[in-house]
Structures are given as structure tokens and as C-alpha cells.
């Protein structure tokens, strides 16, 4: 697994560099997670032909994966810093159960899957420090998450491959939209 942000050799070799600001740390953390997703997608795409499937075909699924919408205030039209930040944190909290599902789905990238999961938890903590309106953030119900996890794990092999691919793609898209919005804040 790649070394977490802040622990690479460049950082060690440059001890007099200015410490990262909160925004820079968040930016670096998201890029680190995107690198992890990229590695996981490589293994998934090598194992199955899901990656060749059209977006339209893949959209026909009953997974309730978080997605950015106009009303969330993260796009240029209707951009709203506070609303957007709440959506990003809420969405990441909702993704956690899906990241848990990914944990036993990889053979050669098992460590990488764990790194993505743990880095996301750290990212949530960074963002919660940045948010002013923490009351607006709804945490998913643990019981609902547990039954969802059981249901996903009970799927046949083909559906599990499809689910893995969809989670990775949706999580990547969510992080990309989140980071683009955060770069405006």
C-alpha cells in the first residue's frame, strides 16, 4: 500500500518546509484516496469485464450510492460552501458501509483496500473540523448498514463483481466532485 500523506520520503527530506494548511491537507488526503481507488480499479478491471460496460447499463442498479446533485451546492451554479460541506461529509459517512464491503473483495490489493477505508475515516475527521454546522450532518443508522452489508455479501459472484466496480466508480466520482468544490472554498 502507498505511504499515507505526510509520510513520503519528500516530506522527510524537507523538514524545514512550511506545514500544510488544513485545506492542503484535505486536498492531499483526497488525492491519496483517489490513487488508492485507481489501484483497486486496476485489479477489478483485470479480473472482470465490468469496466467495459457502458455507464447507462451500470446505472440500472439498486445500490443507493451517494451522488452529487445540483441542490447540494457543490457545483458552480448554486454553489454554497456550507451546504456543500455538509453533503460531502454526509456522503462520505454513507460510503463507509460500501468501503467495508470492499474489504474482502481484493486478493493482491487487500492492503490498498484497507488504506482507502482508513484514509476516508481520517478525511471525514479533517472535514468535520472544517464544518461549522455539524448538526446538519446525519450519521447512517448502524443497524441499517449491518443489514445492507449482509445483503451485499449474499449476492452471487457476478453481482458482487458488479457491486465492487460500481462502488469504486461512484466513490471516485464523488471524491472528484468534492475536491473540485473544496478547491473553491
Amino acid at each position: 500500500a502507498p505511504v499515507p500523506p505526510g509520510e513520503d520520503s519528500k516530506d522527510v527530506a524537507a523538514p524545514h518546509r512550511q506545514p500544510l494548511t488544513s485545506s492542503e491537507r484535505i486536498d492531499k488526503q483526497i488525492r491519496y484516496i483517489l490513487d488508492g481507488i485507481s489501484a483497486l480499479r486496476k485489479e477489478t478491471c483485470n479480473k472482470s469485464n465490468m469496466c467495459e460496460s457502458s455507464k447507462e447499463a451500470l446505472a440500472e442498479n439498486n445500490l443507493n450510492l451517494p451522488k452529487m446533485a445540483e441542490k447540494d451546492g457543490c457545483f458552480q451554479s448554486g454553489f454554497n460552501e456550507e451546504t456543500c460541506l455538509v453533503k460531502i461529509i454526509t456522503g462520505l459517512l454513507e460510503f463507509e458501509v460500501y468501503l467495508e464491503y470492499l474489504q474482502n473483495r481484493f486478493e493482491s490489493s487487500e492492503e490498498q483496500a484497507r488504506a482507502v477505508q482508513m484514509s476516508t475515516k481520517v478525511l471525514i475527521q479533517f472535514l468535520q473540523k472544517k464544518a461549522k454546522n455539524l448538526d446538519a450532518i446525519t450519521t447512517p443508522d448502524p443497524t441499517t448498514n449491518a443489514s445492507l452489508l449482509t445483503k451485499l455479501q449474499a449476492q452471487n459472484q457476478w453481482l458482487q463483481d458488479m457491486t465492487t466496480h460500481l462502488i469504486l466508480r461512484s466513490f471516485k466520482e464523488f471524491l472528484q466532485s468534492s475536491l473540485r468544490a473544496l478547491r473553491q472554498m
Epitope: 483517489l34 458552480q76 472528484q176 473540485r180 473553491q184
Partner: nanobody, 124 residues
């Protein structure tokens, strides 16, 4: 890194239109975000617009909002900047830049590959 080539620049009268293209032969270009920046003589390079890996995620500088449109055709490995209602103050060298994370942003540091630029001149 990807090699980027801009084209479509030229001279146009105020109120006219131009369509810039940013092309690469890189085969995973669809996964990159692409930004357009411009630099007028004696001025800093400034952000114009960008488009994410997800084509619906577009952002514009306030000075071009409603006049410029960024789009992408991944089958042709090309990103376009349609510039309408051009003004003399739009005169600059226009550069395209790519971000391998598919995110983009309004600062030059977010991009890892740059083109050589194409000149746009708006005057009567």
C-alpha cells in the same frame, strides 16, 4: 504526463467567436480534468474554465461566465473552449492543462501537463 496541443486561435473582431481545441494522443485522456488558462501581455496567467472527468462538472471564471463554454469529446481525445461575444480584454495566449486526478481547479498548481498555447487577438 500527457502531451497537449492547442489550436483554433486567431484574430477576431469584438463580438465575434472562436473555438479552441486541446488535443492529445494520450489514450487515457478521458480520465483527466482539463483547464483553460490565459495570459495577456504583462499580466499573470489566469484561470478561464475547466471540465472534470465527469463532463457535467464545469467551472468558469466570472469574467467569461455566460460567454464561454467548455466541453469534451473523449472519443476524439479533445476538449473545446467555445468563445462567444469576444471582447478586446479577452486577447491573450490561451493554454490548456491536464490534471491526472480528473478534478481540475482554478490554480495552476492543480495541473501536471501543459500545452504550448495558442494566441487569441480580439480587435477591430
Amino acid at each position: 504526463e500527457v502531451q497537449l496541443v492547442e489550436s483554433g486561435g486567431g484574430w477576431v473582431q469584438p463580438g465575434g467567436s472562436l473555438k479552441l481545441s486541446c488535443t492529445t494522443s494520450g489514450r487515457r485522456f478521458s480520465e483527466y480534468a482539463v483547464g483553460w488558462f490565459r495570459q495577456a501581455p504583462g499580466k499573470e496567467r489566469e484561470f478561464v474554465a475547466d471540465i472534470g472527468e465527469q463532463a457535467e462538472n464545469t467551472w468558469y471564471a466570472h469574467s467569461v461566465l455566460g460567454r464561454f463554454t467548455i466541453s469534451r469529446d473523449d472519443a476524439k481525445n479533445t476538449v473545446y473552449l467555445q468563445m462567444d461575444s469576444l471582447k478586446p480584454e479577452d486577447t491573450a495566449v490561451y493554454y490548456c492543462a491536464a490534471d491526472k486526478y480528473g478534478v481540475g481547479g482554478n490554480a495552476q498548481g492543480y495541473y501536471d501537463s501543459w500545452g504550448q498555447g495558442t494566441q487569441v487577438t480580439v480587435s477591430s
